[in-house]
């Protein structure tokens, strides 16, 4: 494995990021900030790329299947969380198929830096971003019900995953901004019924003296629908995002409101609080078999079933979140560490003091993970990430649970020959799971002066496709040294987040 020039592999990095985004089933598109490191290895007629990519979440859902650079800037009237990440990626290309870049595996860590960047000085509002988004499922359900009243074609959609929740508080009232995915759950499952997904943005406004979230005085919701088989927006109507800082009451209200939680509602105080399904296994104990690399684009839409799929978390990126508000004490709708107060003025990403143990103010003063410059989380896994589940677009998610006669394996995705699946801690052998390639781990929000812990690099071995010795693993351990001509330059427009990335890697 030899170091290579970061700028020389830019086309591969950009394409790899597009493939990663297209593999993901929840969250927001990653946009490339810079190539932090690059190595390559040549095996016969195949080039293996080992890339480290610094990324930032956009405001476009991965369900949109857009190319990462085609995501428009968000509506500036709506608070937008700043989430950065770093991905270690292994990709391959055959010399005779120059367009055929394949992503073999990837590990990403992500973290919100909104609180750390927030500046609330003289701000008339406090903005909090909640890590514990599940708390607001009820609001999402109410908003979707309202949307259904006005859009008959949405009658069979259900809320899938609550992706982001922001709160804006001030003297004029309180607004909750809830982003969530939905999926079509038709009553009758026809064998080839397309599994349609959507993404909704709901803005709920509450009177300044409201005591609960049940009856917003104003509710605005807009949804887009995506057909995974076409990878296109099938309703063609750009979402209209409402006016987040307008407290008027023209719209019918139908949503709830969370009380004030300390700003730091990101759950930071419980940095290792397990997700509802229990803590994820460590990244190096993935319970997935490794199927062959998928061709570019989303994986085939095979009927996948997996016992953990009933909870709407489809996708590899489910991260267990911690709310990190930055703001005020009220942010606590999620038990966050309300600590630090990170007031963040009106800046769209500002957070206020998270009164919730959030980090925003990390009121508790210490970053839950410290810096871990070597990329290993002290606990051996990223406590906030959800282990990648075997979810695909055909998951059941919020719809009916899979029939009992279906096992835990994907049809058609056994482990590669000779590869036994690694078992999770304390578990005996189980049937092979389908392996959704790649993982994204969400860490608690970063505070000023902290850097994003590096993702794990302990990828399982894989045989190269079309290789003479398919049983022989061909990938080398992920390089730990940094290429001399790296990192590359940050793309313009993202200078404020550069401080959260390590500039050198452990030797």
């Amino acid at each position: 494995v030899s170091p290579t020039d970061c700028s020389a592999v830019e086309p591969e990095a950009e394409k790899a990021l597009d493939l990663i985004n297209k593999r993901r089933r929840d969250g927001y598109l990653f946009q490339l900030l810079r190539i932090a490191d690059a190595h390559l290895d040549r095996v016969e007629n195949t080039t293996v790329y080992y890339l480290v990519l610094d990324v930032q979440e956009s405001d476009c859902s991965v369900l949109s299947r857009k190319y990462w650079n085609d995501c428009e800037p968000p509506d500036s009237r709506r608070p937008s969380e700043i989430v950065i990440g770093q991905c270690k990626v292994i990709a391959t290309r055959h010399s005779h198929e120059s367009q055929d870049l394949r992503v073999i595996d990837f590990n990403c860590t992500t973290s919100s830096v909104s609180s750390a960047l927030a500046n609330t000085k003289d701000s008339p509002v406090l903005i909090d971003f909640f890590e514990d988004t599940e708390r607001y499922r009820k609001q999402a359900n109410k908003a979707l019900e309202k949307y259904k009243e006005e859009n008959d074609d949405f009658a069979s959609f259900r809320v899938d995953r609550i992706e982001r929740v922001a709160r804006v508080r001030g003297g004029e009232g309180t607004g909750y901004f809830v982003d969530f995915s939905v999926r079509n759950c038709p009553r009758h499952h026809f064998p080839r019924h397309p599994n349609v997904f959507g993404f909704c943005r709901a803005d709920l406004f509450y009177d300044v003296e409201a005591l609960d979230l049940e009856s917003p005085k104003n509710l605005v919701i807009n949804c887009e629908v995506f057909d995974p088989q076409e990878h296109e927006n099938i309703n063609g109507v750009p979402p209209h995002l409402g006016h987040p800082f307008h407290w008027g009451g023209h719209e019918r209200s139908s949503t709830t409101k969370p009380p004030f939680k300390p700003h730091g509602s990101r759950d930071h105080h419980h940095p290792h609080k397990p997700h509802e399904h229990g803590p994820p296994p460590p990244p190096d104990e993935r319970d997935h078999s490794h199927g062959p690399p998928l061709p570019q684009g989303p994986p085939p839409l095979l009927p996948m079933s997996c016992s953990s799929c009933q909870h709407a978390t489809f996708g590899t990126n489910g991260a267990q979140r911690h709310s990190h508000n930055n703001n005020s004490s009220d942010l606590h709708p999620h038990k966050h560490h309300s600590h630090e107060q990170h007031p963040h003025g009106h800046h769209p990403h500002a957070h206020h003091p998270h009164e919730h143990d959030t980090h925003r103010q990390h009121p508790h003063g210490h970053h839950p993970h410290g810096h871990h410059p070597h990329g290993h989380h002290p606990h051996g896994h990223h406590p906030h990430g959800h282990h990648p589940h075997c979810h695909d677009f055909q998951d059941y998610g919020p719809c009916d649970p899979p029939p009992h006669n279906q096992g835990h394996c994907c049809h058609g995705h056994g482990p590669p020959p000779g590869h036994l699946r690694r078992r999770g801690p304390g578990k005996g052998p189980r049937p092979f799971h389908c392996r959704q390639i790649g993982s994204v781990y969400r860490l608690p929000p970063l505070r000023k002066g902290e850097v994003l812990p590096l993702p794990e690099a302990n990828f399982p071995s894989f045989p190269l496709p079309h290789h003479k010795h398919p049983l022989k693993p061909d990938n080398q351990p992920f390089p730990q040294s940094v290429s001399e001509s790296c990192p590359g330059k940050f793309k313009s427009g993202f200078p404020q987040v550069s401080m959260f990335f390590t500039h050198t890697f452990p030797k």
Partner: antibody, heavy 120, light 107 residues
Framework: QVILKESGPGILQPSQTLSLTCSFS??????????VSWIRQPSGKGLEWLAH???????HYNPSLKSRLTISKDTSRNQVFLRITSVDTADTATYYC????????????WGQGTLVTVSA | DVQMNQSHKFMSTSVGDRVSITCKAS??????VAWYQQKPGQSPKILIY???IRHTGVPDRFTGSGSGTDYTLTISSVQAEDLTLYYC?????????FGGGTKLEIK
């Protein structure tokens, strides 16, 4: 109409555990967004926030007392509880429960308070 | 923790006077400040929140102002029933903290 009412033991001895109950009406802790705090006031002194519990059981504590405090709720009975372990005379105070708002932890509704005296 | 300092424990005034009670936060609390009035033997009563928003039912002689770290409660024309204790509170971040109180007395 929102009403909150605190009750407690009145008098207890140092090292004992203080158990307080806030009974309320006019709102429900099963309603999303609702949260109740405990605040105390030693006689002739200022107010000190102790703990807060939200509808979804999210809890926040004053770090200076966190190791001794436990807040909990019984949603069906419309009650919030506070336990303070290992009390001493400095814990003598009037204890209030108060309802916060969605927009922030400022408190428009308070109980009338219950006086707790810690005395040997 | 954010400390809230009410530098005057007592302030003397006369009925009909205009009086201003001040509160200083140890850091910028972005207008997340409330004011309470407490009469002897009673629980505190909210007057102002978000620095300047008067709570429902509070007489309009009470006004709040301020930003950053400095906040003021002003009573434009003091009435006899206003001669009591006033507290500020920051609702910016936990732990939510109160000032030490200012007692308004008759001159």
């Amino acid at each position: 109409q929102v009403i909150l009412k605190e009750s407690g033991p009145g008098i207890l001895q140092p090292s004992q555990t203080l158990s307080l109950t806030c009974s309320f009406s006019g709102f429900s802790l099963s309603t999303s967004g609702v949260g109740v705090s405990w605040i105390r006031q030693p006689s002739g002194k200022g107010l000190e926030w102790l703990a807060h519990i939200y509808w979804d059981d999210d809890k926040h504590y004053n770090p200076s007392l966190k190791s001794r405090l436990t807040i909990s709720k019984d949603t069906s009975r419309n009650q919030v509880f506070l336990r303070i372990t290992s009390v001493d005379t400095a814990d003598t105070a009037t204890y209030y429960c108060a309802l916060g708002t969605v927009g922030g932890p400022w408190f428009p509704y308070w109980g009338q308070g219950t006086l707790v005296t810690v005395s040997a | 923790d954010v400390q809230m300092n009410q530098s005057h424990k007592f302030m003397s005034t006369s009925v009909g006077d205009r009086v201003s009670i001040t509160c200083k936060a140890s850091q910028d609390v972005s207008t997340a400040v409330a004011w309470y009035q407490q009469k002897p033997g009673q629980s505190p009563k909210i007057l102002i929140y978000w620095a300047s928003i008067r709570h429902t039912g509070v007489p309009d002689r009470f006004t709040g102002s301020g930003s950053g770290t400095d906040y003021t409660l002003t009573i434009s024309s003091v009435q006899a029933e206003d001669l009591t204790l006033y507290y500020c509170q920051q609702h910016y971040s936990t732990p939510w903290t109160f000032g030490g109180g200012t007692k308004l007395e008759i001159k």
